[in-house]
Interface confidence: low
């Protein structure tokens, strides 16, 4: 979690002198409670916006907006603490709006916004706006919270952000998978414009089951520049297990910008009608970061084989 770097953070508006400060997420009104505290924010809205850094990088940001209630407690409102919590890591980042002048009632409801918290693709956040000073221990809460799910890199606008492009979001392998016979699977995909290697991860399943019955990993060496954007094909040899007929093919690139953490692409071939189902095998997990759905690869005795070609 971080703040977007480029422009001075502003919270002043007509009729209000305000400054944005870094916050430890522990306002001193917790430690030194006040008798009179303002009411909670109203109509907290979180939206996905996009902003450029000074370097020209494009990042997704959380646009936080809220209004004040039209009660007398605005006379005691000294500012606001904005907190963003990343749910999977418990990482929290806060900023503080410090009002340097007292708020007065006016015809239009007071409205505040902040768009400088950089968020990550596919992550969920809890956004909280606390009015300051915070209430005494037994006082009514004067904050409002909302969860905010950031779309992943498949989302059209997200795809062109710097973090997604760094993960290889612009590469569309256009995978096709074809069953040649009971023992062979042909995989075709489009190479990207980088001389980097790929791994094809084949996971086969019985009909209607999620425990795999065969797995195989095939390494594709880095293509030469003249092969960029060309179709590559690989023929994978399947293990001859009756009913082990639903095949998921996942292609993992190793682009220089994301190494072992690039976005993966998958394609699946369904079983023909009414197969038999063998004994399931427990799931395993790889060392690198899971991506794009199923990512459990293993083999109880890898007898799969494969060969591949780049097409010009």
């Amino acid at each position: 979690l971080r703040l977007l770097d480029h422009r001075a953070l502003v919270c002043s508006q007509p009729g209000l002198n305000c400054t944005v400060k870094n916050s430890t997420c522990l306002d001193d009104s917790w430690i030194h409670p006040r008798n009179l505290t303002p009411s909670s924010p109203k109509d907290l809205q979180i939206q996905l916006h996009f902003a450029h850094t000074q370097q020209g990088d494009l990042f997704p940001v959380a646009h936080i907006e809220w209004t004040l209630q039209t009660d007398a407690s605005i006379l005691y409102l000294e500012g606001a603490e904005l907190s963003v919590l990343q749910l999977n890591t418990n990482e929290r980042l806060c900023v503080k709006f410090q009002f340097l002048s007292m708020l007065q009632h006016h015809r239009k409801r007071w409205r505040f916004s902040f768009s400088h918290f950089v968020v990550d693709p596919g992550q969920e956040y809890e956004v909280t706006v606390h009015h300051l000073p915070k209430p005494i221990p037994d006082g009514d809460p004067n904050h409002q919270s909302k969860n905010f799910l950031v779309p992943d890199c498949e989302h059209a606008r997200m795809k062109v952000t710097t973090p997604c492009m760094s993960s290889g979001s612009l590469w569309d392998p256009n995978i096709t998978v074809e069953t040649l016979d009971t023992q062979h699977l042909r995989v075709d995909f489009t190479l990207w414009n980088e001389s980097t290697h790929y791994q094809i991860l084949l996971t086969s399943f019985p009909h209607m089951e999620n425990h795999s019955c065969f797995e195989h990993m095939h390494h594709i060496p880095a293509p030469r520049p003249e092969e960029f954007h060309q179709r590559s094909n690989v023929t994978l040899t399947l293990r001859n297990l009756k009913g082990c007929c639903r095949h998921q093919v996942q292609i993992q690139p190793f682009f220089s910008s994301c190494l072992n953490d690039c976005l993966r692409h998958s394609a699946t071939v369904s079983c023909p009608e009414m197969p038999d189902t063998p004994e399931p095998i427990p799931d395993y997990m790889p060392l690198w970061e899971p991506r794009s759905g199923s990512s459990d690869y293993k083999d109880d005795d890898d007898k799969g084989s494969s060969h591949h070609h780049h097409h010009h």
């Epitope: 990482e91 596919g122 760094s166 195989h216 109880d300 890898d302």
Partner: antibody, heavy 118, light 107 residues
């Protein structure tokens, strides 16, 4: 030069806490998963914890689950291990290690020593 | 969880000897196996990954083989600088368990 430097080890009483840090340099830290591995005096290597590049996947060894917390700050090129409720058997040299594309761990720190003793 | 065992636990051999260390997984792990060398007082160093791929900079006298459950590390001609403890490690899923180690020294 690709480098990992651990710090934060020391002597702590049973039940106490320590926070280990690992400072990475010479590579794009934010693109790599990371691990903590430990080695008790005169013993073998024991994998402790794993965190993926974007912190979306975290694993722990059963021996530390519920007591240790792995985290990272990609902006600071730093990996952390918060160790609570420490026991005598947690006494070890703790290494941070980077996984290699293709498998294994190809970059290791020099280790930091944690001693749990009353 | 999958258990990793190594044999022998220690061995002594003469300079120039061919040395073989085996590692066994209690369940199949395909080729998701690495070998490390750790010299006394030093951090471990990666020798082999993907069961048989030699890590850059590692002398060619080291080689790895195997797939599924049984794996072998071979030193074709033991050198004095090879005195160390050797560990295998599986990395197909967490926990990423190490074998107990094999201590190699010179007769």
């Amino acid at each position: 030069e690709v480098q990992l430097v651990e710090s934060g080890g020391g002597l702590v009483q049973p039940g106490g806490s320590l926070r280990l840090s690992c400072a990475a340099s010479g590579f794009t830290f934010s693109s790599y998963s990371m691990n903590w591995v430990r080695q008790a005096p005169g013993k073998g290597l024991e994998w402790v914890s794993f965190i993926s590049a974007r912190s979306s996947t975290i694993y722990y060894a059963d021996s530390v689950k519920g007591r240790f917390t792995i985290s990272r700050d990609n902006a600071k090129n730093s990996l952390y291990l918060q160790m609570n409720s420490l026991r005598d058997e947690d006494t070890a040299v703790y290494y941070c290690a980077r996984p290699k594309v293709g498998g294994g761990m190809d970059v290791w720190g020099q280790g930091t020593t944690v001693t749990v003793s009353s | 969880d999958i258990q990793m065992t190594q044999s022998p636990s220690s061995l002594s051999a003469s300079v120039g000897d061919r040395v073989t260390i085996t590692c066994r997984a209690s369940q199949g792990i395909s080729n998701y196996l690495a070998w490390y060398q750790q010299k006394p007082g030093k951090f471990p160093e990666l020798l082999i990954y993907a069961a048989s791929t030699l890590q850059s900079g590692v002398p060619s006298r080291f080689s790895g083989s195997g797939s599924g459950t049984d794996f072998t590390l071979t030193i074709s001609s033991l050198q004095p600088e090879d005195v160390a403890t050797y560990y295998c490690q599986k990395y197909n899923r967490a926990p990423f368990t190490f074998g107990p180690g094999t201590k190699v020294d010179i007769k």
